[in-house]
């Protein structure tokens, strides 16, 4: 049957930065078509296993899918089809009116030059030199990839690593977030209890594990040089990293304007879209040339801040100079000034 | 073994109608994702694609030949047609029967082809 | 109308030699190119779908690459029965062909 398991089956991810997330696009027939996400008998609104993608992600090179459900901002510059049957079936779909249709996005994740182990070892006191060092981040609640609590393990030791807010470890982290296939380092995820009540309901890979290391060489190359074992705190924080390969990303998008390549700038937080406030930290184009290329446009031509006269205007906030390096947006509820910016249309 | 056999070609005077069909085996155009089409090519020259027909009755036309074109289709006897009307010299061509996935995979499989001739 | 510019439109060559025809795009087709290979009084065959998949039974010698607007295929060590003309097909949108490339042997 016709479906994105299909060997055949091509598929790509529009609107975004990356060719691992954005808006599903599918090849039938004749062309390229915008996949609703009310097909297959599902409301506009809701989130799917993202394993049922799997495929998707595969065939685009990409690693695990993250997400599948409502993209939230619908271009529709060529033809949206909604299918039915089974969930990913393409024998039976029809066009779309463009104003009925919410697109369908997909997030997989970024691929991986080497893969990090997918579950931890089982915690065990017999050490297994033959097993190289390794490094794994467990996501925190929100599940981002490339951001989360750093865990070494060598041989089959394995735990979390501990971490004095004094400590000048630069080096150590970008070296770290390299080693996870991650970019480089961004900033510490805020202050996680290596002591932490253990959660009953929680599955128990997810429990501490019976060791802990401590920084030993914040300059180190090689990771077998990089920490040392030592007894497990009752309290204290662990290292948690954000690193510049994190994903989802923010997503942007431009209303108002007159076409999708001008308008102002939005936000997406979660499932809510909002206005983007004005930043000091960007005042360059370099923000604006990001958002441009994601909506799939030329570069800026210009931008320009609104007036904020209203103090109820609200919005949210990036403190980086770029959004691709926003790993959340801040919420602003007054005086927000909302940017205007014009990018090159390419089908002017 | 995928084959399709085209007739219906032969000589036919300017202005009048040519309907052409194509039988084809080891495939149905019941199988989702399946469709049969045209593409013609003129003595000497290029391929030039007519029309095609999907297993669920879609149909696409070149959009210079679309005002004098109809494709049909008859799933239970594995035969696709293809009408045009008021035929010109130019319509002078090699006329194929090919199939193709809704994946694009390309035309993956042709028909030997009819010859039709526009002449008074 | 997606308008494919095919060239060079005939060439000479000789057995073993290394081949290349390239097909050029009016705008973005992104990879959904074909290539085909006609010989003479014979329907045409289907070599290269999706730019760079071979079709069933098409030799390893015949490899497909490209992207956008630019497309290649080349014939690693050309052999006597390659002899044909080759026609390179988009279809990002409707679908439009190259006007073909006669290859001889010298």
């Known amino acids: 049957r016709l479906s994105w398991y299909d060997p055949d089956f091509q598929a790509r991810l529009t609107r975004s930065n990356s060719k691992c997330q954005g808006q599903l696009e599918v090849y039938l027939k004749d062309g390229w078509h915008m996949v609703c996400s009310q097909s297959w008998g599902r409301s506009s609104k809701q989130w799917e296993d993202p394993s049922q993608a799997s495929k998707v992600c595969q065939r685009l090179n990409c690693g695990v899918p993250l997400s599948l459900g409502p993209f939230l901002v619908t271009y529709t510059p060529q033809s949206s089809i909604i299918c039915y049957g089974q969930l990913g079936s393409f024998s039976n779909c029809s066009h779309s009116r463009n104003d009925m249709c919410h697109s369908l996005g997909l997030t997989c994740l970024e691929p991986q030059k080497t893969t990090p182990p997918t579950t931890r070892p089982p915690p065990t006191t017999t050490p297994e030199p033959t097993a190289p060092p390794r490094l794994q981040l467990v996501a925190q609640s929100g599940g981002q990839h490339c951001a989360g609590v750093v865990e070494f393990y060598s041989g089959s030791l394995g735990g979390t690593i501990s971490y004095e807010a004094q400590d000048k470890t630069q080096d150590l982290e970008n070296f770290l977030c390299n080693n996870l296939q991650c970019g480089s380092f961004l900033k510490h995820l805020p202050e996680t209890e290596a002591g932490r009540a253990q959660d009953p309901g929680e599955p128990r890979e997810h429990q501490p594990l019976p060791i802990q290391w401590k920084i030993q060489n914040s300059s180190c190359t090689s990771l077998e040089h990089c920490f040392r074992k030592i007894k497990p705190q009752k309290s204290g924080r662990v290292l948690a990293l954000l690193c510049s390969g994190f994903q989802p990303k923010v997503q942007s998008r431009l209303v108002g304007g007159s076409s999708i390549c001008e308008g102002t700038v939005e936000v997406r937080q979660g499932a809510q879209w909002a206005a983007l406030c004005d930043s000091s930290s960007a005042r360059s184009s370099l923000r604006w040339e990001e958002v441009c290329r994601e909506q799939q446009c030329g570069s800026v031509n210009s931008y320009r801040v609104l007036d904020a006269g209203d103090p109820t205007s609200r919005g949210l906030f990036c403190p980086h100079q770029k959004l691709s390096q926003c790993h959340e947006l801040w919420e602003r509820n007054s005086y927000c000034k909302k940017v205007f910016v014009t990018c090159q249309d390419p089908n002017p | 073994e995928v084959q399709l056999v085209e007739s219906g070609g032969g000589v036919v005077q300017p202005g009048r109608s040519l309907r052409l069909s194509c039988t084809f085996s080891?495939?149905?155009?019941?199988?989702?994702?399946?469709?049969v089409g045209w593409i013609r090519q003129a003595p000497g020259k290029g391929l030039e694609w007519v029309a095609h027909i999907w297993w669920d009755d879609d149909v696409y036309y070149n959009p210079s030949l679309k005002s004098r074109l109809t494709i049909t289709k008859d799933a239970s006897t594995d035969t696709v047609y293809m009408e045009l009307s008021s035929l010109r010299s130019e319509d002078t061509a090699v006329y194929y029967c090919?199939?193709?996935?809704?994946?694009?995979?390309?035309?993956?499989?042709w028909g030997q082809g009819t010859l039709v001739t526009v002449s008074s | 109308n997606i308008v494919m510019t095919q060239s060079p439109s005939s060439l000479s060559a000789s057995v073993g030699d290394r081949v290349t025809i390239t097909c050029q795009a009016s705008?973005?087709?992104?990879?959904?190119v074909a290539w085909y290979q006609q010989k003479p009084d014979q329907s045409p065959k289907l070599l290269i779908y999706w730019t760079s998949t071979r079709h069933t039974g098409v030799p390893d010698r015949f490899t497909g690459s490209g992207s956008g607007t630019d497309f290649t295929l080349t014939i690693s060590s050309l052999q006597p029965e390659d002899i044909a003309t080759y026609f390179c097909?988009?279809?990002?949108?409707?679908?439009?062909f190259g006007s073909g490339t006669k290859l001889e042997i010298k």
């Open positions: 090919v199939r193709r996935r809704a994946t694009g995979t390309g035309f993956d499989y």
């Open positions: 097909h988009q279809y990002n949108s409707y679908n439009t």
């Open positions: 705008q973005d087709v992104g990879t959904a």
């Open positions: 080891g495939f149905s155009l019941s199988t989702s994702g399946m469709g």
